[in-house]
C-alpha cells in the first residue's frame, strides 16, 4: 500500500502480513496486507485492527476490526462507545456510509481515525497529537510502527521511477518495470492517466499513486482509494500547505 | 535497543509545536545530525535489528536529499508529558481528562496535530 507517515514522507510499501501502523501507550493499530495479484510485490490492506487501550476514567479497552467486505460500525464487543466509564462518550464510532466509511473519534487522546472500504481493500487515515504519537514508555518492547518511521527500505517500491518508466508505454511494455504481473493489456498508460486526472487534477503523489495502482492492477477502484485518501488528508491534516505532496529529486537510487 | 527513541526524538525535533524545522532549514540538518549521533550510540545493541538499519539508511537518504553536511550543530528534542495510560492512581471525577484539547490547554498551547494514511497498493 501507499503510506504517508507522520512526518509527511510518502512511500509505496510491499509489506505483506500484519504490520503495526501505530503502537503507543494509548493505541495500537495493525494493518494486514495481501498481494493484489498472485505473485505480485504490490500489496493492499485487507484487514485493520485498532485497539484503544484502557484509559483512566474515560474508556475500557476497545477493539475495532475491519476486513474486506466487513466494515462494522461497532467495536468487536458490539458497543459503539468507550464502555461503562464516566467518560465513555469520549470514544465513539460513527458510520458515515454503510459498509464503506467509518469514523472513530477518540477525544480523550485528541485522535480521529477514518477507515474506508474502497473496492476490495481498506484505507486508513488518522489525525493524532504529536505527544500521543510519542507516548511510548518501553522503547525496547513496543514495536516498530510504520506511521512513525515508514517502511523499511527493503520493503519499499520506487513507484516514482516506475511512473517515469511507464510514460508513453502500454501495459505490455511495463512487464519488466512492474512489481506485479502486468495489468490487463486493455489498460494503457494514457487511460490510467485520464482516469486519475478525472479524480485527482493536481499531479501530486496521490495522482502518481493512482496511476501506479491502475497500471499494476487494472482495478479502477484504486482511483477512488487515492481520491478518498486525499480527501481524508484535507479533513485531518493540520497543515493546509502540506495537503499535496510532490516528487522530490532523488540523489540515491530507489 | 533504543533506536525507536532516536526515531521519536528526531520526529519531535522536526515536528515540534511552535516552529517545526522545515525540510530545508539548518534546523532540519541539525536534527538529522542529532538523529545520526543517536543511532551511532545505539549501534552495539541495535545493529542486528531492522529498525536500526532502516534509520541508518533513512538518515543517509535525508542527508543527501537536503544537502546536509555530516559536521555541524545538533539539536535537542522537545518533549512534553501526557497523563499516564491505564488505571491511574490519581482518579479524576472531572470529565475534562476525557477531552484531550480541554486538558491540554491547561498546560500548553494548541496541540500540534499530525497525520498518517494508508491506501491503495
Amino acid at each position: 500500500p501507499h503510506l504517508r507517515t507522520f512526518t509527511d514522507r510518502f512511500q509505496t510499501c510491499k509489506v505483506q502480513g500484519a504490520w503495526p501502523l501505530i503502537d503507543n501507550n494509548y493505541l495500537n493499530v495493525q494493518a494486514t496486507n495481501t498481494p493484489v495479484l498472485p505473485g505480485s510485490a504490490a500489496t493492499a490492506t485487507s484487514k485493520l485492527t485498532i485497539i484503544f487501550k484502557n484509559f483512566q476514567e474515560c474508556v475500557d479497552q476497545k477493539v475495532y476490526q475491519a476486513e474486506m467486505d466487513e466494515l462494522p460500525a461497532a467495536f468487536v464487543d458490539g458497543s459503539k462507545n468507550g464502555g461503562d466509564k464516566h467518560g465513555a462518550n469520549s470514544l465513539k464510532i460513527t458510520e458515515k456510509v454503510s459498509g464503506q466509511h467509518v469514523e472513530i473519534q477518540a477525544k480523550y487522546i485528541g485522535t480521529t481515525i477514518v477507515v474506508r472500504q474502497v473496492g476490495r481493500y481498506l484505507t486508513f487515515a488518522v489525525r493524532m497529537p504529536e505527544e500521543v504519537v510519542n507516548a511510548v514508555e518501553d522503547w525496547d518492547s513496543q514495536g516498530l510502527y510504520l506511521c512513525l518511521r515508514g517502511c523499511p527500505l527493503n520493503q519499499q517500491i520506487d513507484f516514482q521511477a516506475f511512473h517515469t518508466n511507464a510514460e508513453g508505454t502500454g501495459a505490455r511494455r511495463l512487464a519488466a518495470a512492474s512489481p506485479a504481473p502486468t495489468a490487463p493489456e486493455t489498460f494503457p498508460y494514457e487511460t490510467a492517466v485520464a482516469k486519475c486526472k478525472e479524480k485527482l487534477p493536481v499531479e501530486d503523489l496521490y495522482y502518481q499513486a493512482c496511476v501506479f495502482d491502475l497500471l499494476t492492477t487494472g482495478d479502477v477502484n484504486f482511483t477512488l482509494a487515492a481520491y478518498y485518501a486525499l480527501e481524508d488528508v484535507k479533513m485531518l491534516h493540520s497543515n493546509k500547505d502540506k495537503l499535496h505532496l510532490y516528487e522530490r529529486t532523488r540523489d540515491l537510487p530507489g | 535497543c533504543k533506536i525507536l527513541k532516536c526515531n521519536s526524538e528526531f520526529w519531535s525535533a522536526t515536528s515540534g509545536s511552535h516552529a517545526p524545522a522545515s525540510d530545508d532549514t539548518p534546523e532540519f540538518c541539525a536534527a538529522l545530525r542529532s538523529y545520526a549521533l543517536c543511532t551511532r550510540r545505539t549501534a552495539r545493541t541495535c545493529r542486528g535489528d531492522l529498525a536500526y538499519h532502516s534509520a541508518v539508511h533513512g538518515i543517509e537518504d535525508l542527508m543527501s536529499q537536503h544537502n546536509c553536511s555530516k559536521d555541524g550543530p545538533t539539536s535537542q528534542p522537545r518533549l512534553r508529558t501526557l497523563p499516564p495510560a491505564g488505571d491511574s492512581q490519581e482518579r479524576s471525577d472531572s470529565p475534562e481528562i476525557c477531552h484531550y484539547e480541554k486538558s491540554f490547554h491547561k498546560h500548553s498551547a494548541t496541540p500540534n496535530y499530525t497525520h498518517c494514511g494508508l491506501f491503495g497498493d
Epitope: D140 | R44, G48, D49, A51
Partner: antibody, heavy 115, light 112 residues
Framework: EVQLVESGGGLVQPGGSLRLSCAAS????????MNWIRQAPGKGLEWIGM????????HYADSVKGRFTISRDNSKNTLYLQMNSLRAEDTAVYYC????????WGQGTMVTVSS | DVVLTQSPLSLPVTLGQPASISCRSS???????????LEWFQQRPGQSPRRLIY???NRFSGVPDRFSGSGSGTDFTLKISRVEAEDVGVYYC?????????FGQGTKLEIK
C-alpha cells in the same frame, strides 16, 4: 507476549551433528536480531552467536566458529542452530534469545554429546 | 575477550536485608558518549535467564524497583534493597560493548 520455544536437542555422539530450532511468537520476528546462548550443566552462560534480522551478518564465539552455523527463516518465524563436529564440551542447555542483545529468552533445549 | 569477574560467587542473605553483587571488567565497557552496555540477568532455579538491568542502571520492563544497577568504566554493582524469597537464584553480569559478548561467572544468591 514474547514466546521462544527451542527444540531439536538430544543425545549425539562426538563428531556428530544436530540442528536446533527456535520457534518465535508474540513479536515481529523478522524485525529483530537473534542470539544463541548455552549453559553447560552446573556452569555459567556462554554466548554462542547472533544473526541480523535479514541474515546479512552473523557473529560467532571463537569456541564454535567453523563448526556451528546460525540461520533463520523469517517466513516461518524460526531461528536455527546447525551444530557439526560436536564435542563433549558442547554438552549444554541451548537457549535462543530475542534482540541484538538478548532480552527475552526461551526455556532451552538440552544437548548431550557423549559416546 | 572481555573478562567479567563477579564477587562474591556465593551470597547468603537474610530475607528483607539488602544485597550487593560486584562485577569487574577487564577493560572499559564505555562505548560512546557515556553509553555503557552492561546488563544484569537473573536465573531462578530451573528457569531460563531473565533480563533485569540494561545499560548499567535501566530496569527492564516488569522488574521490581528493589533492583538497581550502578557503576561506570570497569566497576559495576547490582543492588537489591530488600531481598525476597523469589530473588533466590544466580545473577550474571553481561557486556555487549565488545565482541564477543561475554557473561560473568555468576553469583548465587541464597537465603540464610
Amino acid at each position: 507476549e514474547v514466546q521462544l520455544v527451542e527444540s531439536g536437542g538430544g543425545l549425539v555422539q562426538p563428531g556428530g551433528s544436530l540442528r536446533l530450532s527456535c520457534a518465535a511468537s508474540g513479536f515481529t520476528f523478522s524485525n529483530y536480531g537473534m542470539n544463541w546462548i548455552r549453559q553447560a550443566p552446573g556452569k555459567g552462560l556462554e554466548w554462542i552467536g547472533m544473526i541480523y534480522y535479514d541474515s546479512s551478518e552473523k557473529h560467532y564465539a571463537d569456541s564454535v566458529k567453523g563448526r556451528f552455523t546460525i540461520s533463520r527463516d523469517n517466513s516461518k518465524n524460526t531461528l536455527y542452530l546447525q551444530m557439526n563436529s560436536l564435542r563433549a564440551e558442547d554438552t549444554a542447555v541451548y537457549y535462543c534469545a530475542k534482540g541484538t542483545t538478548p532480552d527475552y529468552w526461551g526455556q532451552g533445549t538440552m544437548v548431550t554429546v557423549s559416546s | 575477550d572481555v573478562v567479567l569477574t563477579q564477587s562474591p560467587l556465593s551470597l547468603p542473605v537474610t530475607l528483607g536485608q539488602p544485597a550487593s553483587i560486584s562485577c569487574r571488567s577487564s577493560q572499559s565497557l564505555e562505548y560512546s558518549d557515556g553509553y555503557t552496555f552492561l546488563e544484569w540477568f537473573q536465573q531462578r532455579p530451573g528457569q531460563s535467564p531473565r533480563r533485569l538491568i540494561y545499560e548499567v542502571s535501566n530496569r527492564f520492563s516488569g522488574v521490581p524497583d528493589r533492583f538497581s544497577g550502578s557503576g561506570s568504566g570497569t566497576d559495576f554493582t547490582l543492588k537489591i534493597s530488600r531481598v525476597e524469597a523469589e530473588d533466590v537464584g544466580v545473577y550474571y553480569c553481561f557486556q555487549a560493548t565488545h565482541d564477543p559478548l561475554t557473561f560473568g561467572q555468576g553469583t548465587k544468591l541464597e537465603i540464610k
